[in-house]
């Protein structure tokens, strides 16, 4: 065990010096003591607290050949990359016997150019829209005075006279750069330069202009875009799904949207190739040379019903005396809406046309007038939706039914563009 020394005499012959420097500086504190007998371990204190993980080295040199002779002990504390947390009062401490000895203090101070805790960040903003930027710097030495610059031009007449930590920008009409200077007694530090990119404002008032079964015409009001003209607008349409729940601001639909680009002006677009009688959600964003605006909220729209695109299929018409049996199948062509029923017309060579609404049935028995001797009797059938009638089938001749024969099936159709009849009373 180390032999004690008298209480009145400190073993320290060299005390820690002072270090004052800028952040990142590397320095060494040193203390030296002379003791008799086995050298003690030297501990380092900062502001009275033992440094458990100190980067210290201890060198011991005997002054004689006997173990009980005096020793010179040197302890060096290395401070690498000086930080604010390293500052304070440093002392060496040793335990000799039952006594504790502490060296005279040395001081570590931080003093240099301002150090940025926060710097302005790059960002995008909509034209003429207010935003804030942040900058924060510290010493020591304090105080630190800030000066904001926009496109390298000071925004105040002198440091400390304008906004300090937070800069409120009421709006920009062109892409600009911002930085801040931090001034203290040691000099000036300049922050990174933030680029604030001015994008077009979100378009407004997205609305339907006209609707057709497979086509929607939409229009919108463009937002301001600063000094940068809009180059185009992009419209997206997505099939609505009740389970999908596209809310007003929901960012992305679950399936791939139908995307169309519109040259601007005009701020209008015809969206084609849509499904009839189908709910969609649409949104629009506009783009300048600086980039795209944010999307509008999703707008729910719906294509209207259309008329069926084809006539009923596989029409058969047979006659048995004064009765005729007619049946058919649903059109293969798209209905473009909800099928509400079928209309049937029949006519003889010299008799007026008879019109009937069959409803949703796909067969009908006709009671023919007279003895059924009317010649060249023909039947036409058309499907209809709420939007109106689809094309009529080509006239199907009523054929006499012979027991044991299959019923004739007629698949000939009229051209859809040629309406067979008009129904002013329907």
């Amino acid at each position: 065990a180390p032999r004690g020394t008298q209480a009145e005499e400190s073993p320290f012959v060299g005390n820690p010096g002072n270090i004052t420097g800028a952040r990142g500086l590397t320095g060494t504190l040193r203390c030296q003591l002379q003791v008799q007998g086995e050298p003690p371990e030297v501990h380092w204190l900062r502001d009275g607290q033992i440094l458990e993980l100190a980067d210290s080295t201890q060198t011991q040199v005997p002054l004689g050949e006997d173990e009980q002779d005096d020793w010179i002990v040197v302890s060096q504390l290395r401070i690498t990359s000086l930080q604010l947390s390293d500052t304070g009062q440093y002392q060496c401490l040793v335990f000799l016997g039952h006594q504790t000895f502490v060296s005279q203090p040395g001081y570590v101070g931080l003093e240099g150019l301002p150090y940025f805790l926060e710097e302005p960040e790059d960002r995008t903003v909509a034209a003429n829209t207010p935003f804030n930027l942040s900058c924060q710097a510290q010493g020591p030495p304090e105080p630190v005075d800030l000066l904001w610059l926009q496109d390298a031009v000071p925004l105040a007449t002198a440091p400390g006279h304008g906004p300090q930590r937070s800069l409120h920008v009421p709006g920009l009409n062109k892409t600009s750069s911002f930085s801040c200077e931090a001034h203290n007694a040691k000099g000036v530090t300049t922050s990174r330069t933030a680029t604030i990119t001015v994008l077009p404002q979100q378009p407004r008032n997205l609305h339907l202009v006209s609707r057709q079964p497979t086509e929607l015409e939409v229009a919108w009001t463009p937002g301001l875009s600063g000094i940068y003209p809009l180059t185009h607008c992009t419209l997206q349409a997505v099939l609505s799904d009740d389970g999908m729940g596209i809310q007003a601001g929901e960012p992305d639909p679950p399936e791939e949207p139908l995307t169309s680009q519109a040259s601007v002006p005009p701020h209008q677009l015809r969206l084609g190739s849509l499904h009839p009688h189908t709910p969609y959600h649409i949104r629009v964003a506009c783009t300048s040379s600086q980039g795209p605006s944010s999307w509008t909220h999703w707008l729910p729209v719906e294509t209207p019903e259309g008329v069926p695109l084809g006539p009923p299929e596989n029409i058969s018409a047979t006659r048995n005396g004064s009765q005729a049996f007619v049946h058919w199948q649903e059109p293969r062509a798209p209905l473009q809406g909800t099928l509400l029923g079928y209309r049937l017309a029949y006519q003889g060579q010299d008799t007026p046309e008879v019109l009937m609404d069959i409803g949703l049935r796909q067969e009908v028995t006709l009671e023919l007038q007279g003895d059924g001797s009317v010649s060249n009797l023909t039947v036409c059938v058309a499907a209809y939706t709420a939007a109106g009638d689809g094309p009529w089938s080509l006239p199907v001749p009523l054929e006499a039914w012979r027991p044991g024969e299959a019923q004739p099936v007629h698949q000939l159709v009229k051209e859809p563009s040629t309406p067979a009849f008009s129904w002013p009373w329907w």
């Epitope: 440091p159 006279h161 001034h183 000099g187």
Partner: antibody, heavy 113, light 107 residues
Amino acid sequence: QVQLQESGPGLVKPSETLSLTCTVSGYSITSNYWGWIRQPPGKGLEWIGYITYSGSTSYNPSLKSRVSISRDTSKNQFSLKLSSVTAADTAVYYCAITTFYYWGQGTLVTVSS
Amino acid sequence: DIQMTQSPSSLSASVGDRVTITCRASQDIGNYLRWYQQKPGKAPKLMISGATNLAAGVPSRFSGSGSGSDYTLTISSLQPEDFATYYCLQSKESPWTFGQGTKVEIK
């Protein structure tokens, strides 16, 4: 600690040039802006102008044709020159950092023949 | 130039009184306003910066308020050491301009 000290003649003849120097200690003049303010006896404060850390200047237009502020960074000093002085230029002249945390104690300059 | 009109030019008050000094700019100066205290034979001392921010070491009985072109310095409870002349300064635009001063005297 930061100290500013004005120096220069206390008496200047009319039509001559008033020259004052401000010596700064504890703060580098290559940081911040440094200015001159004056106060005629019994009157209010008047801003004369400043020099920036980079050496550019800004002056009160009412004095602009007669005033010049310069600096010597090696001595950490900045100076004021005011030409063609008249009795109306009699005042206590203060140098200060433009944040106005630190001022010189002021020096009285009298313009008289 | 921006003109700064300070009022009153002088006032008499007693220790403990609440004192209000106003400064009106000839145009909007956006809070680029400072208040100074000056005692005879001394350099001015910064009291308030940015219209409302108390300078280091200034007692909390001092406060600043205002916006646009109208600003106020308030001393909530006047102390003996507060008897002095007070100046406002706008630094929104060059040239910087001071108010003509308000002398606070003992009643």
